[in-house]
């Protein structure tokens, strides 16, 4: 006889990285017929929602209107059908960004490289932090972690065209409080080329926010829940 229900999915919209003072919604998706959802923060009960009518709703949302460092941390959710509770969801690490300072991101040998060359990113922040995070924009938000007194190095090995994309870095004051994002660096990877000995023109980056790569729609989210959980856990453990 089943003692618990399957665990729900948990994710953050638009993203698990939330600029301070901005809003975020924590979503918990269980089963139709669930009469109660509980959101836990750092192991303690944080909020409760009772959907109406339960048989027509399989997802609830917990709204945080004003993100700050106190709200950053690990969230999980559970739901109840009748008297039967579910397993807890995976942990969602909610991160507050835009804290304190802005790092600078540089890439060696440069932003335009040839397939097969080894590339290293350098993230620098002069204030008190020793952990740095490098993110490649995109659906899966690839994250690398690095350490150093004022800067960290992120070697990328021999690059392929799969490494093309826009990168940003953060300084991390703790696991859940990150700096402002650096300006973006757009890495262009070409195949072997005959002649580019003169310096390439300065790369130009749109002055848009780094939110362009955050998921803002539910389309495709269902299949990405596990990916978000996995990404966040790998990053923050």
């Amino acid at each position: 006889q089943q003692q618990t229900l399957p665990k729900p999915f948990i994710w953050a919209e638009p993203h698990f990285m939330v600029p301070k003072e901005k809003q975020v919604t924590i979503c918990c998706q269980g089963n139709y017929g669930a009469v109660e959802y509980q959101l836990h923060f750092e192991g303690s009960l944080f909020a409760v929602d009772r959907p109406k009518p339960p048989e027509r709703i399989n997802k609830v949302q917990f709204y945080i209107p004003d993100m700050n460092s106190r709200m950053a941390g690990q969230y999980s959710c559970i739901y109840r059908v009748g008297e039967l509770w579910s397993e807890p969801s995976n942990l969602l690490d909610l991160v507050v960004t835009e804290m304190y300072d802005t790092p600078t991101l540089s890439v060696h040998p440069g932003p335009e490289v040839i397939s097969g060359e080894k590339v290293t990113f350098y993230c620098r922040l002069d204030t008190a932090t020793s952990m740095f995070l490098l993110l490649k924009e995109g659906r899966s938000s690839h994250v690398q972690r690095g350490y150093g007194k004022v800067q960290a190095e992120f070697p990328l090995g021999p690059v392929t065209t799969a490494h093309r994309g826009t990168y940003r870095c953060f300084g991390s004051y703790n696991n859940h409080a990150w700096s402002f994002p650096s300006e973006p660096v757009k890495l262009l990877v070409t195949g072997d080329i005959e002649n580019t000995s003169l310096a390439p023109e300065d790369p130009t980056f749109p002055a848009d926010t780094w939110g362009t790569y955050l998921l803002t729609t539910e389309t495709g989210l269902q299949k990405d829940h596990a990916l978000w959980d996995h990404t966040a856990q790998n990053l923050l453990r």
Partner: antibody
Framework: QVQLQQPGAELVKPGASVKLSCKAS????????MHWVKQRPGQGLEWIGM????????NYNEKFKSKATLTVDKSSSTAYMQLSSLTSEDSAVYYC????????WGQGTLVTVSA | DIQMTQSPSSLSASLGERVSLTCRAS??????LNWLQQEPDGTIKRLIY???SLDSGVPKRFSGSRSGSDYSLTISSLESEDFVDYYC?????????FGSGTKLEIK
């Protein structure tokens, strides 16, 4: 076109310090790495370190960490390398080199350490 | 640190001859290798970058190639101005390191 201007020579006393300059023109100074390379008379080349003028990021060869300090002045598009506690082992030609792939080389500054 | 073993240390050859210089990397450097030319007055010029890409203004008689961890600079037909010093340089991983150099002399 790209130009890197370095003084031809510097004569310094043992134990003293010297600050070598490298004035860049012909490209956007803040966009590309600047390297420094040492060559002792009749010897090969040794990489000292590099600096990114925009971010201030530096990377030093461990061997030169206590010897060399790299800085830049963005307003004058000039890179500097300060060498401290000089000995005869520091007598060499020092090249500044711009671009991550070492594309353009200055003419070098001959540093002579002598009493 | 990555060691770059350059050979030969000196090479005597005749005008019009084809010669190859080699550098062996002690660790994987991908295609992050340059070939540099140094004149007797100390002037240094990059000839090849990223293993095989020819710099602007460099004569087509110069070419670069790779076989595993061995990187080669080939001069297809030597001219008088080619009899100078050559160095390889890996820029894959810091500290970036140079080969010990090859002195190309006229026979």
């Amino acid at each position: 076109q790209v130009q890197l201007q370095q003084p031809g020579a510097e004569l310094v006393k043992p134990g003293a310090s010297v600050k070598l300059s490298c004035k860049a023109s012909g490209y956007t100074f803040t966009s590309y790495w600047m390297h420094w390379v040492k060559q002792r008379p009749g010897q090969g080349l040794e990489w000292i370190g590099m600096i990114h003028p925009n971010s201030g990021s530096t990377n030093y060869n461990e061997k030169f960490k206590s010897k060399a300090t790299l800085t830049v002045d963005k307003s004058s598009s000039t890179a500097y390398m300060q060498l401290s506690s000089l000995t005869s082992e520091d007598s060499a030609v020092y090249y500044c080199v711009y671009d991550g792939r070492f594309a353009y080389w200055g003419q070098g500054t001959l540093v002579t350490v002598s009493a | 640190d990555i060691q770059m073993t350059q050979s030969p240390s000196s090479l005597s050859a005749s005008l019009g001859e084809r010669v190859s210089l080699t550098c062996r990397a002690s660790q994987d450097i991908g295609s992050s290798l340059n070939w540099l030319q140094q004149e007797p007055d100390g002037t240094i010029k990059r000839l090849i970058y990223a293993t095989s890409s020819l710099d602007s203004g460099v004569p087509k008689r110069f070419s670069g190639s790779r076989s595993g961890s061995d990187y080669s600079l080939t001069i297809s037909s030597l001219e008088s101005e080619d009899f100078v010093d050559y160095y390889c340089l890996q820029y894959a991983s810091s500290p970036f390191t140079f080969g010990s150099g090859t002195k190309l002399e006229i026979k």
